[in-house]
């Protein structure tokens, strides 16, 4: 129940995390204008990793996509490739880890299959989390650096005599929703890490006990291999004894006196 | 269509208050930001504050800061300019002007009301 | 404070001639967010409030003929009229509508000979 309860929660919390990576990487306010002890414009610009934004006092929004490729800083493009790497591994993630859930029954798949699919669902949500946060961290290292250097130089001289105003940019929200989409994804990749440990099949599994417990019957298997003790590798024959869903007691239970005969 | 009608205008003397109102219908005035400018008799136009839609920003020319005081009545659709600590200087006719939606730019102008201080 | 200067301060041209005016400011108006120049213009004719004329330095307002015209970037721009008419006698400010404290031009009378 433990182990359904977090690959369920794995998943959600992915998931939210996998729709803000998404909301960040399409928002146009990465960075915006910073607005202390800067010259007053009429105007507040911001920016996105598509195409910069400008909104006048009344409203009236207007903004231009970055239309060059080659034209844009490297860090931009490693930026939007870190985001864009994220999102389509969480969104494989997502598209594995709904097949793989406890909850879910497709046809005879079995709970090792689950456990493999979990692991590797729960691997990508890791690295969907990382390539956010590393994308979001590069982002705002270039900001930093850029805000101090234009800070040294508020108005940068052009002919000695006219000044143009060095508009300075400060973190846009889109930074914090995409931490926090990039933590949730994480976590949630975690979680289902932890979920496949409790899904997938130990070498010895005793669940046969329950069913051995009332009589003293034995099934030998060519080999001479108790079958109802579990020894062995039994892993193929596993859903014969497959009473269905586990508890957490059943999963460490212990050989009894009604194992051997 | 966009009407402006400044009042309050007048004679006062120096060191003295004065508080003009501005008239507004045609338009959905909470939308807009609006100024104020004036002209002194045969000069140029100067700005002279600009107090946003919602009155979130609000700006003066550094010759009124601390003198003048731009204020709104979004349900009265009204516009108003407290004048303190009047001047000679300060006697031009008054303009309230509306803040264009595209361009920053000042599109609706009122007739102007005149403000002369004088002892 | 930007600093807003028109050349020239009057001119006098005969009807249906080409007149150009200038302004110039003491720092770029230029926005690099919309790649947009904050500079508007405006006609005062004698005895009325000011009439917007252009906006974002060369965009024409709505019902303004299309004989005027503005063009230029940064800190130096023009209004044009490409064939005065007897009409457009005025005097023409520019003002930088970016930077706060936002500056008026000095003026531009246009007379006709």
């Known amino acids: 129940m433990a182990v359904t309860a977090c690959q369920g929660l794995g998943f959600v919390v992915s998931l939210i995390g996998i729709a803000g990576i998404i909301a960040a990487t399409c928002m146009d306010q990465w960075s915006t204008q910073d607005l202390y002890n800067n010259p007053v414009t009429a105007v507040f610009n911001y920016q996105g990793l598509w195409r910069s934004c400008v909104r006048e006092s009344s409203g009236f929004t207007e903004c231009r996509g970055y239309f060059t490729l080659l034209g844009l800083p490297a860090m931009l493009q490693a930026v939007r490739a870190l985001m864009i790497v994220g999102i389509v591994l969480g969104a494989i993630g997502l598209l594995v880890s709904i097949f793989a859930l406890k909850c879910i029954r497709i046809g005879s798949m079995e709970d090792s299959a689950k456990a493999n699919m979990t692991l590797t669902s729960g691997i990508m949500f890791i690295v969907s989390g990382l390539c956010a946060i590393a994308g979001v961290s590069v982002f705002a290292n270039m900001l930093v650096t850029n805000f101090w250097m234009s800070t040294a130089n508020m108005y940068t001289g052009m002919g000695g005599m006219v000044q143009t105003v060095q508009t300075r940019y400060t973190f846009g929200a889109a930074l914090f929703v995409g931490w926090v989409a990039g933590g949730l994804t994480l976590i949630g990749g975690v979680m289902m890490c932890i979920a496949c440990r409790g899904l997938a099949p130990e070498e010895t599994n005793y669940k046969a006990v329950s069913y051995h417990a009332s009589g003293h019957s034995v099934a030998y298997k060519p080999g001479g291999f108790k079958a109802s003790t579990g020894f062995g590798s039994n892993t193929k024959n596993k859903k014969i004894y497959d009473g269905g869903a586990r508890t957490e007691d059943e999963v460490q239970s212990y050989p009894s006196k009604h194992d051997y005969v | 269509e966009v009407q402006l009608v400044e009042s309050g205008g007048g004679l006062v003397q120096p060191g003295g208050s004065l508080r003009l109102s501005c008239a507004v219908s045609?338009?959905?005035?909470?939308?807009?930001?609006m100024h104020w400018v004036r002209q002194a008799p045969g000069k140029g136009l100067e700005w002279v504050a600009y107090?946003?839609?919602?009155?979130?920003?609000?700006y003066y020319a550094d010759s009124v800061k601390g003198r003048f005081t731009v204020s709104r009545d979004n349900a009265k659709n009204s516009l108003y300019l407290q004048m303190n600590s009047l001047r000679a200087e300060d006697t031009a006719v008054y303009y309230c002007?509306?803040?264009?939606?595209?361009?920053?730019?000042?599109?609706?102008w009122g007739q102007g009301t005149l403000v002369t201080v004088s002892s | 404070d930007i600093v807003m200067t028109q050349s020239p301060d009057s001119l006098a041209v005969s009807l249906g001639e080409r007149v150009t005016m200038n302004c110039k400011s003491s720092?770029?108006?230029?926005?690099?967010?919309?790649?947009?120049?904050?500079l508007t213009w405006y006609q005062q004719k004698p005895g009325q409030p000011p009439k917007l004329l252009i906006y974002?330095?060369?965009t024409r307002e709505s019902g303004v003929p299309d004989r005027f015209s503005g063009s230029g970037s940064g800190t130096d721009f023009t209004l044009t009229i490409s064939s005065v008419q007897a009409e457009d006698v005025a005097v023409y400010y520019c003002?930088?509508?970016?930077?706060?404290?936002?500056?008026f031009g000095q003026g531009t009378k246009l007379e006709i000979k």
């Open positions: 003002q930088n509508v970016y930077i706060y404290p936002l500056t």
């Open positions: 002007v509306r803040s264009g939606y595209y361009g920053q730019s000042l599109d609706y």
């Open positions: 720092q770029s108006l230029f926005n690099s967010g919309n790649q947009r120049n904050y």
């Open positions: 045609g338009f959905t005035f909470s939308s807009f930001g």
């Open positions: 974002w330095a060369s």
């Open positions: 107090i946003s839609s919602g009155t979130t920003n609000i």
